[in-house]
């Protein structure tokens, strides 16, 4: 009875993300056989995320709706190993939107999930953030620098990284 | 004031090439973006060319990509506009624009009176 | 490209009375309650002159008279009341995403 209303609850639960997500890789937490966590396939996980990147070129606004359609944010990079992580999917020649922006032009930085922007947890190039006008952030490839962060206008169409929390069943 | 002055247009055979130039005075031009946008004979505006103010990125839409280079001299409030392989649909009244950016966009705040290129055999 | 299309085409107002210009677009231009459209006046062998950006900011110079509401996908530019100076063609552009695009005008004449 147990073990079948856990699988009612996991069918109801799985059916809310069908669709947008019709099918999720999913792998047991720990050692207990209850407890399962999920990403859309092919989404990869890290820790509690998991993530997308976006071969599509879009706008900042465009990217970040995008993501948002499929239950997710534009990426918040909160240490230096999710970056470490992420960057093993990114391409060198390209650059991705990255959750953080400038709206107002002032240096206000903002993540698009509210977490608040930590000076220290920064991940720029030298030199950048360079430009008021660039109110929007990539992650790109730096020979010199390997990857990093600059700012760059919004409007411009590039690729992106969409970032969500795990599905738990 | 904000002046802007487009010179450089004239009459030009499909395939030849032309450089426009837009002088700017009355405001700091190497803290702005600057844009040409064309209007031809009857027609909506058409974005031709965008360079940021820094002078660190330029953008075509498809139409003129490849044929079009914008690029600036801050030094001497100078923008230009180098057209190369011209067609007859590049005919129109060329107009040097600034950029004032809000927000995730930006929007044209002062425009210069225009130049006129015709391309025809 | 983000497709906006203006309506009318033309429109004859006495002075006085109101004007009333609609532009849609072919997807959103807002976001987050930012609404990037803007709105141009351009009189005869004259450069377009820009009258509101931001969907309902009014420049600064520009006669209150002239006032732009809208979101997402549907704006509005209204001259109220009209005046015989405001004889010219108006245009509505979009700049949240490259290419910048414009309306394809609306013409407006005065009685």
């Known amino acids: 009875n147990f073990m079948y209303s856990k699988t009612v609850k996991r069918l109801s639960k799985l059916r809310e993300y069908q669709q947008y997500h019709p099918s999720l890789t999913c792998v047991m937490e720990g050692k207990d056989i209850e407890d399962w966590s999920c990403c859309p396939t092919p989404w990869t996980s890290f820790q509690s995320s998991c993530y997308f990147i976006s071969t599509g070129m879009q706008s900042w606004t465009k990217s970040q709706k995008n993501c948002s359609v499929m239950g997710a944010d534009l990426v918040v990079i909160n240490t230096r190993e999710e970056q470490d992580f992420i960057i093993q999917n990114l391409k060198r020649n390209s650059s991705y939107f990255l959750g953080l922006s400038d709206p107002g032009g002032r240096r206000h930085w903002q993540w698009v999930d509210q977490t608040p922007y930590n000076e220290n947890v920064t991940f720029w190039h030298s030199g950048e953030p360079n430009n008021l006008d660039e109110r929007c952030a990539i992650i790109n490839f730096r020979s010199s620098e390997e990857w990093g962060w600059n700012d760059i206008h919004c409007h411009v169409p590039q690729k992106s990284i969409c970032k969500m929390k795990k599905i738990y069943i | 004031e904000v002046q802007l002055v487009e010179s450089g247009g004239g009459l030009v055979k499909p395939g030849g090439s032309l450089r426009l130039s837009c002088a700017a005075s009355g405001f700091t031009f190497s803290s702005y973006g600057m844009s040409w946008v064309r209007q031809a004979p009857g027609k909506r505006l058409e974005w031709v060319a965008t360079?940021?103010?820094?002078?660190?990125?330029?953008y075509y839409p498809d139409s003129v990509k490849g044929r079009f280079t914008i690029s600036r001299d801050n030094a001497k409030n100078s923008l230009y506009l180098q057209m190369n392989s011209l067609r007859a649909e590049d005919t129109a009244v060329y107009y040097c624009?600034?950029?004032?950016?809000?927000?995730?966009?930006?929007?044209?705040?002062?425009w210069g009176q225009g130049t006129t290129v015709t391309v025809s055999s | 490209d983000i497709v906006l299309t203006q309506s009318p085409a033309s429109l004859a107002v006495s002075p006085g009375q109101r004007a009333t210009i609609t532009c849609r677009a072919s997807?959103?231009?807002?976001?987050?309650?930012?609404?990037?459209m803007h709105w141009y006046q351009q009189k005869p062998g004259q450069p377009p002159k820009l009258l509101i950006y931001?969907?309902?900011n009014l420049e600064s110079g520009v006669p209150a008279r002239f006032s732009g509401s809208g979101s997402e996908t549907d704006f509005t530019l209204t001259i109220n009341p009209v005046e015989a100076e405001d004889t010219a063609n108006y245009y509505c552009q979009q700049s949240i995403e490259d290419p910048p695009t414009f309306g394809g005008g609306t013409k407006v004449e005065i009685k």
């Open positions: 360079i940021s103010s820094g002078d660190s990125y330029t």
């Open positions: 931001a969907a309902s």
């Open positions: 997807e959103s231009v807002s976001f987050h309650g930012t609404h990037l």
């Open positions: 624009a600034r950029q004032l950016y809000y927000s995730y966009g930006y929007y044209f705040d002062y």
